[in-house]
């Protein structure tokens, strides 16, 4: 198979320049270099590098490479601070929060939005070829820390938080930025950097639009953008489908699969080092699987490890993402198709509403036929290499409930069994929140890390079981996480990208980079819980809530 290049800018993707600089380890974080801007045009940069490279007998020292980088690249910052016009330091949702300490916490989180607000500098629009950043029209909220650009799935929880904070225009602008990316690349890439071009992230665009519509009833926005929402579905249907045979029948489902040449530019050193001693074919396959795992948003986890015996033991080089049909991706897609159907109904397009409704139903049926494990009363990722369920706890297992991708009659019959499976999994027992897995692998999407979007998914999934016990548990899980974030905020004056299931308030670790502060989706999820359960949540067990 002819693999496409990782992106269309050799300096940032596939070139000797990139290889030499990243392998010299000029920076602790490989992402630092690919986020620099070129001081000259691409042609000059590449030509001059080859001259420099030959001048130093094709073996420049680290110091010489650093001199070259300092002359040809700079970090003038492609973004500038931006003040969203719709920001308010006293949004209406705060009045719903009964507990004084949590109301202060909510106010504190709301006040982080302007600190994370950015817009692309004019220079990036004028010389787009000299930047890895993709210039986008509207101001936006960055996740924080090393993540100084838009990320696809992060945006869902950021937008949810913005809408709770009353920042409808900012939320709309962020959706429009994603649509710009969709038009530019034919799909929404992992993030707004050229080097993310050939991989996407969980397809949450339609859910974002649904959330935006729920708050604004902006029918004109739906009318103007419905074609793009269809286009996003088409990308996944065209490029990520697999046919799974179960019981002699074929079922169409999606996988993460991002084939392109070479290592991830932003983790070049790490990927290249991991393939040391590999054959060319094994190296190519590893790079495809690691990019596919990055596309999942879960970078990285035992969830994508697939050993010869079908287990999830092993290390990063045992990643085989292409053979795994993920529960959450397919639940998201079923939801996305249903949203498009609902939007067409609102726009009075009955034929298209029926067509997309049928697609959503097909997907729900296929999830049930392939991913549901009746013995365990749970959905599991499916290993298509060995035709087996991956019977391990992951926080993503219950995602079909979150996306309303479960037949209501089936749910009624199985509600108690599903709730029992969730409680007995052990995933909801920790004082710091819901961990992504129960396996301590050292990877950042494994135990003991608690990732805010997964807590959001889990809480909604449990609540959608619909029984009184489930609704109580959902609130308890939200309470645990809010308290953990609150304690962390009090202690460190920061919101973190991820938390520690075993120690409330403590940031998570592991993976390829240090903990990041900010943090977009963490803020969004806490605001979601404060908004939803504000009248019941407390900062601690003393229930010392002086009602205001």
């Amino acid at each position: 198979m002819d693999l496409p290049l990782t992106c269309t800018k050799p300096v940032y993707c596939n070139s000797n320049l990139l290889h030499q600089i990243q392998m010299a380890r000029l920076y602790n974080d490989s992402k630092t270099f690919v986020d620099l801007q070129m001081n000259f045009d691409e042609n000059k940069t590449l030509t001059d590098f080859e001259t420099f490279f030959n001048l130093h007998n094709k073996n420049p020292t680290k110091e010489q490479l650093m001199e070259f980088v300092n002359e040809y690249f700079s970090n003038d910052n492609e973004l500038e601070p931006w003040q969203p016009k719709d920001f308010s330091d006293n949004p209406a949702f705060l009045a719903k929060i009964k507990d004084d300490a949590l109301r202060e916490f909510g106010k504190g989180i709301n006040n982080i939005w302007p600190l994370l607000a950015r817009k692309v500098k004019a220079e990036v629009f004028q010389k787009p070829d000299q930047f890895s950043l993709v210039p986008l029209t509207h101001g936006f909220i960055i996740p924080g820390g090393r993540f100084k650009e838009i990320y696809y799935w992060d945006t869902f929880w950021i937008i949810e938080g913005l809408l709770i904070s009353g920042m409808q225009e900012t939320a709309k602008g962020m959706i429009e930025n994603l649509i710009e990316l969709l038009n530019l690349f034919g799909h929404i890439p992992n993030g707004s950097r050229g080097y993310y071009q050939q991989r996407s992230q969980p397809p949450m665009l339609n859910a974002m639009v649904a959330t935006y519509y729920m708050y604004t009833k902006d029918l004109e926005f739906l009318r103007n953008n419905i074609a793009y929402l269809e286009k996003e579905l088409d990308f996944w249907m065209d490029n990520r489908v697999v046919s799974v045979n179960r019981g002699g029948k074929n079922y169409t489902l999606l996988r993460y699969y991002a084939p392109s040449k070479g290592p991830r530019p932003e983790s070049y050193y790490e990927d290249y080092s991991n393939t040391e001693g590999f054959s060319e074919e094994d190296s190519t396959n590893f790079c495809i699987d690691i990019k596919s795992a990055a596309e999942s948003g879960w970078d990285f986890s035992t969830r994508w490890f697939l050993m010869p015996d079908g287990s999830n033991n092993g290390t990063l080089t045992d990643l085989h993402t292409r053979y795994i049909i993920p529960v959450d991706l397919n639940a998201i897609f079923a939801g996305a198709a249903q949203y498009v159907s609902n939007f067409h109904a609102l726009l009075k397009n009955p034929q298209k509403a029926a067509r997309y409704g049928q697609l959503a139903q097909t997907w729900r049926d296929n999830i049930q036929a392939v991913l549901w494990n009746d013995q365990d009363a749970m959905w599991y990722d499916f290993n298509i290499r060995d035709n087996l369920h991956r019977r391990y706890y992951y926080s993503s297992n219950a995602a079909p409930l979150w996306q309303n991708a479960v037949n209501p009659d089936f749910l009624k019959l199985n509600a108690d069994r599903i709730l029992k499976a969730i409680t007995e999994s052990g995933g909801v027992d920790f004082p710091g929140g819901v961990p992504t897995s129960l396996i301590r692998s050292g990877e950042q999407w494994d135990f003991p890390n608690v990732w805010p979007p997964e807590v959001s998914i889990e809480v909604a999934a449990i609540e959608n079981i619909g029984t009184p016990e489930a609704i109580t548990l959902a609130q308890e899980v939200a309470q645990t996480f809010v308290r953990s974030c609150h304690w962390g905020f009090q202690k460190y004056k920061q919101m973190f990208e991820k938390y520690d299931a075993e120690t409330p308030g403590r940031f998570g670790g592991g993976g390829e980079y240090n903990v990041q502060f900010g943090f977009g989706w963490s803020n969004g999820v806490v605001l979601e819980f404060l908004n939803k359960y504000g009248s019941q949540l407390t900062a601690d067990d003393s229930n010392n809530t002086n009602n205001s």
């Epitope: 198979m1 002819d2 693999l3 496409p4 269809e230 088409d234 249907m237 065209d238 490029n239 990520r240 489908v241 697999v242 046919s243 029948k249 074929n250 079922y251 169409t252 699969y257 084939p259 067509r355 049928q358 697609l359 097909t362 296929n366």
Partner: nanobody, 127 residues
Framework: QVQLQESGGGLVQPGGSLRLSCAAS????????MGWFRQAPGKEREFVAA????????YYADSVKGRFTISRDNAKNTMYLQMNSLKPEDTAVYSC????????????????????WGQGTQVTVSS
């Protein structure tokens, strides 16, 4: 295994019309991109037309544009190829194909993109 069965082929005079059908054995048909290919005697199999799962997007080989129309009825698990203004050079075995899973990037005119094939139906254009 997805079974595909073509029908509607036959002998027709130049300038005449034919409508080919391709029936699929499974309801998952509605999620597949489907294509028509043809192979003339002594020649390579070539792309004719393709249609996305939703029927909104269609693709044609330059040689048939404006004369052939691809369509599908997902309720009936069937795809069609309406062939008008037929020419002697359209003589070939026409096969339908289903793209049930993607192996790379989306090239609806590439043989390698299709995973299931029908047996084919003969179309002969001759006076």
């Amino acid at each position: 295994q997805v079974q595909l069965q073509e029908s509607g082929g036959g002998l027709v005079q130049p300038g005449g019309s034919l409508r080919l059908s391709c029936a699929a054995s499974e309801r998952t048909f509605r999620t597949y991109t489907m294509g028509w290919f043809r192979q003339a005697p002594g020649k390579e199999r070539e792309f004719v037309a393709a249609i996305r799962w939703n029927g909104d997007s269609t693709y044609y080989a330059d040689s048939v544009k404006g004369r052939f129309t691809i369509s599908r009825d997902n309720a009936k698990n069937t795809m069609y190829l309406q062939m008008n203004s037929l020419k002697p050079e359209d003589t070939a075995v026409y096969s339908c194909a289903a793209r049930a899973y993607s192996i790379g990037y989306y090239y609806p005119n590439a043989l390698s993109e299709y995973n299931y094939w029908g047996q084919g139906t003969q179309v002969t254009v001759s006076s």
